[in-house]
Interface confidence: low
């Protein structure tokens, strides 16, 4: 399923757009990443409810959402093998176009420790609160769900797009449409600002075809960091409405003349920019000359001005702009050392942890301690990570090599251990004889039980069966449906394989079968080995069959 | 200067409806919600409801939910209140009054309010 | 729906005097370190005047002897010197939830 927008919210130098659609949270990335954005980053307050105001513009629009609670991806993701660090706010997450670790969080509860899968973040929106400011989306952490399997709930996704600058909404001083184009394909008719590179279509008039005058502009850089849409004058002008119509697109002040023409106009300390519509302070700082951050600090009596930094960074060959003083030159970390803006953090490789003696120093993350091992079953650490082991009669699966899964021995790589029936258990098999035969002492073999099966043609004749009674069947010539003697062939029954979770006894195969010429007198069991009991353990049923448990070892016994 | 300027008073019948309006002046009309409030004789404030004025979006209170709409219309920078369904109890005056789009949504601005009287 | 519960409802007071008219929110109106709410003044026959908004903050134009303070569920207005035009109605209101809602108000009036 593909993403519907939109709902756009575009402030201080970025546009957030909200997309309903069920996609996973790389596909999301991908749709985001198409019109040059990422999925959108929430650092800051100020930024989470410029993200809710997005959302809420979309849920107000979207009558299908009946959900109660209902998730949007945002861009933040904690990578296969990377753990959880409960004393980051971002818990070991990170950003998806990379950047600091923020200290703003608002995770809706408590993290499960996890190492082993990617996990991402969605906004979590209830649907039955208002969407008020102080209810500020929560964070909620999972699996990424994928193209199949999109997650479960989520609802869509949020975009952000960053731009150089911004250009003003373009005033109307008349009856008239505008439309936006943004540079991430997105047409809005009202933005509070509008991103550079944006083409604005104006059509003038009340609808009536005849009056309609179109302008095209575009939102350009006049200078640095200085946006605008290259046109001079309110548009769409009437002498109809003078200054009554939104202030004749007036900034500030409208000023009429007896003709029905006007002017715009500034208030004292103001002074009108070349669009001859928008007033500029007149105070050198009001325009921001400064930027990245940097403060700008007035001159004596007000005529010029100077751009300061923060700590942690320094102003470039420009004088207007900070950039940052990379601390890492100085190998201040025991592992790995990131630059962050205005400052530095430590970071320790996979399978460490902050802590031991001195400043930024890494110890190994014991993943196996109580309460956090990753493993079904034994876990070993090892210096920066861990090997998980399973016990006798298990061997490790999962994509991960976490989960431990049972050996089925009844069709093991050597073939099957019963010389008869073989049944597997969770972490074990025991073997088991037909009706007729009773488990040797040893637990694999088969011998003749006190009463004997005739062959088809009728019973076998009294000495033959006074000499087989009680007597261990030679491995030659055994009472085994597994495995002929050599040079044998293996006698093949002549129905479909009882299955022990059927409710047909296992009589009900036709167990005598003439046994090959060379050993007179024994008759062959069918080959029925690999009947596994369904939910532990059960007894053949129909005759007195004898079964034992088996260790892998070949000892007697249970696990 | 901020203006909000309110049609004059209203009286009508039980049973019928109102349609109440605010001009907008001296700011971006759009950068603002707009919220009615209303006041019974003698009375304390109550919240009608709010209209974002860039998109018509709307939110009500759930009390009047199905008895009131909110409209505007950006050419003449104007948002109206329709009240249907009139009783005696809904004798007040009904004041419009913005606030900002996000954030404490405060009301920073009134309209100096229009009286209705439902009257038989 | 968050009560607002207003007290006294009505307080004589004289000119100079320091006043105090206190509200009570039904559950907190607080969230991420911010009170979401306000105060407003109301004369008769005119539209309501707002005067502290966030719990603690003077809009511009009012004057300083007016401060508001509290958090939570517990807020309080001050006058710290009553003057002969503060004489009205004073109206609490919490913008936290929808929907939102006023106190039922606080009526000050000469001695």
């Known amino acids: 399923t593909g993403a519907d927008t939109e709902a756009v919210v575009c402030v201080g130098t970025a546009c957030y757009t909200a997309h309903s659609g069920k996609l996973s949270a790389a596909e999301a990335q991908n749709h985001c990443n198409q019109n040059g954005g990422n999925l959108a980053t929430v650092k800051s307050k100020e930024e989470a409810q410029h993200v809710q105001r997005v959302l809420a513009q979309l849920l107000r629009r979207e009558a299908a959402l009946t959900a109660r609670m209902s998730k949007f991806w945002i861009g933040l993701q904690r990578e296969k093998g990377k753990c959880l660090d409960p004393s980051l706010p971002l818990k070991g997450f990170s950003w998806v176009g990379g950047g600091e670790d923020t200290p703003y969080s608002n995770w809706h509860k408590e993290l499960r420790n996890s190492c082993i899968s990617k996990r991402c973040v969605s906004l979590l929106l209830d649907l039955s609160q208002p969407l008020l400011p102080s209810r500020l989306p929560k964070w909620s952490e999972g699996p990424c769900g994928s193209p199949g399997s999109p997650g479960s709930n989520i609802e869509g996704f949020v975009c952000k797009f960053s731009f150089k600058g911004m250009c003003r909404p373009l005033a109307l001083g008349g009856p008239g449409q505008v439309t936006y184009t943004t540079p991430f394909q997105t047409t809005s008719s009202s933005l509070e600002a509008v991103p550079f590179a944006s083409a604005a279509n104006v059509a003038c008039g009340e609808g009536d075809k005849d009056e309609t005058q179109s302008h095209y502009f575009l939102c350009k850089e006049k200078a640095p960091d200085v946006f605008d849409w290259g046109s001079s004058g309110p548009l769409c002008v009437s002498p109809k409405y003078g200054c009554n119509f939104n202030n004749g697109g007036c900034h500030q002040d409208c000023f009429e003349g007896g003709d029905g023409s006007f002017l715009c106009g500034c208030r004292p300390g103001f002074r009108l920019l070349d669009d001859l519509v928008t007033c500029a302070s007149r105070n050198p700082c009001s325009s921001s000359p400064c930027r990245g951050g940097a403060t700008c600090v007035l001159g004596p009596h007000g005529k010029n001005y100077t751009c300061r930094c923060p700590q942690g960074y320094q102003l470039d060959s420009s004088q207007l702009d900070c950039v940052d003083v990379d601390e890492c030159q100085d190998s201040p970390c025991a592992q790995e050392c990131v630059n962050t803006p205005g400052g530095f953090r430590c970071e320790c490789w996979v399978g460490y942890e902050p802590g031991g003696p001195g400043e930024g120093a890494c110890q190994d993350v014991d993943e196996c301690a109580l309460g956090r091992s990753p493993c079904a079953q034994g876990c070993t650490n090892t210096d920066g990570s861990f090997h998980c082991s399973c016990e006798e009669g298990y061997v490790l699966a999962g994509e991960d090599g976490t989960q431990c899964q049972d050996v089925d021995e009844c069709v093991g790589p050597g073939g099957p251990l019963c010389d008869s029936l073989c049944f597997n258990t969770q972490g074990s098999f025991h073997c088991g004889c037909l009706p007729g035969w009773v488990l040797a002492p040893n637990g694999v073999s088969c011998t003749m039980g006190p009463v004997s099966l005739g062959p088809p043609s009728g019973p076998p004749d009294e000495e033959d069966k006074g000499e087989k009674e009680g007597s261990t069947v030679p491995r030659a010539a055994t009472a085994s449906p597994t495995r002929g003697p050599e040079g044998t062939p293996k006698a093949t029954p002549t129905t479909s394989r009882p299955s022990l979770s059927s409710d047909a006894p296992i009589t009900s195969a036709p167990l005598k079968m003439l046994a090959p010429s060379g050993s007179p007198g024994v008759w062959r069991e069918p080959s029925i080995h690999h009947a596994t009991a369904a939910s532990g353990p059960q007894e053949p049923a129909g005759g007195d069959s004898s079964v034992a448990t088996q260790n892998n070892d070949g000892t007697d016994g249970q696990k | 200067q901020v203006q909000l300027q309110q049609s004059g008073a209203e009286v009508k019948k039980p049973g019928a409806s109102v349609k109440v309006s605010c001009k907008a002046s001296?700011?971006?009309?759009?950068?603002?919600?707009m919220h009615w409030v209303r006041q019974a004789p003698g009375q304390g404030l109550e919240w009608i409801g709010e209209?974002?004025?860039?998109?018509?979006?709307?939110y009500y209170n759930q009390k009047f939910k199905g008895r009131v709409t909110m409209t505007r219309d950006k050419s003449t920078s104007t948002v109206y209140m329709q009240l249907s369904s009139l009783t005696s109890e809904d004798t007040a005056v009904y004041y419009c009054a913005r606030s900002v789009y996000y954030g404490n949504k405060y009301f920073d601005v009134w309209g100096a309010g229009t009286t209705v009287t439902v009257s038989s | 729906d968050i009560q607002m519960t207003q007290s006294p409802s009505t307080l004589s007071a004289s000119v100079g005097d320091r006043v105090t008219i206190t509200c009570k929110a039904s559950?907190?109106?607080?969230?991420?370190?911010?009170?979401?709410m306000n105060w407003y003044q109301q004369k008769p026959g005119k539209a309501p005047k707002l005067l502290i908004y966030a719990a603690s903050n003077l809009e511009s134009g009012v004057p300083s002897r007016f401060s508001g303070s509290g958090s939570g569920t517990e807020f309080t207005l001050t006058i710290s010197s009553l003057q002969p035009d503060d004489f009205a109605t004073y109206y609490c209101?919490?913008?936290?939830?929808?929907?939102?809602?006023f106190g039922g108000g606080t009526k000050l009036e000469i001695k």
């Open positions: 209101q919490q913008t936290n939830e929808d929907p939102r809602t």
């Open positions: 209209i974002d004025p860039s998109a018509s979006y709307t």
């Open positions: 559950q907190s109106v607080d969230y991420a370190g911010d009170s979401y």
């Open positions: 001296g700011y971006t009309f759009t950068s603002y919600w």
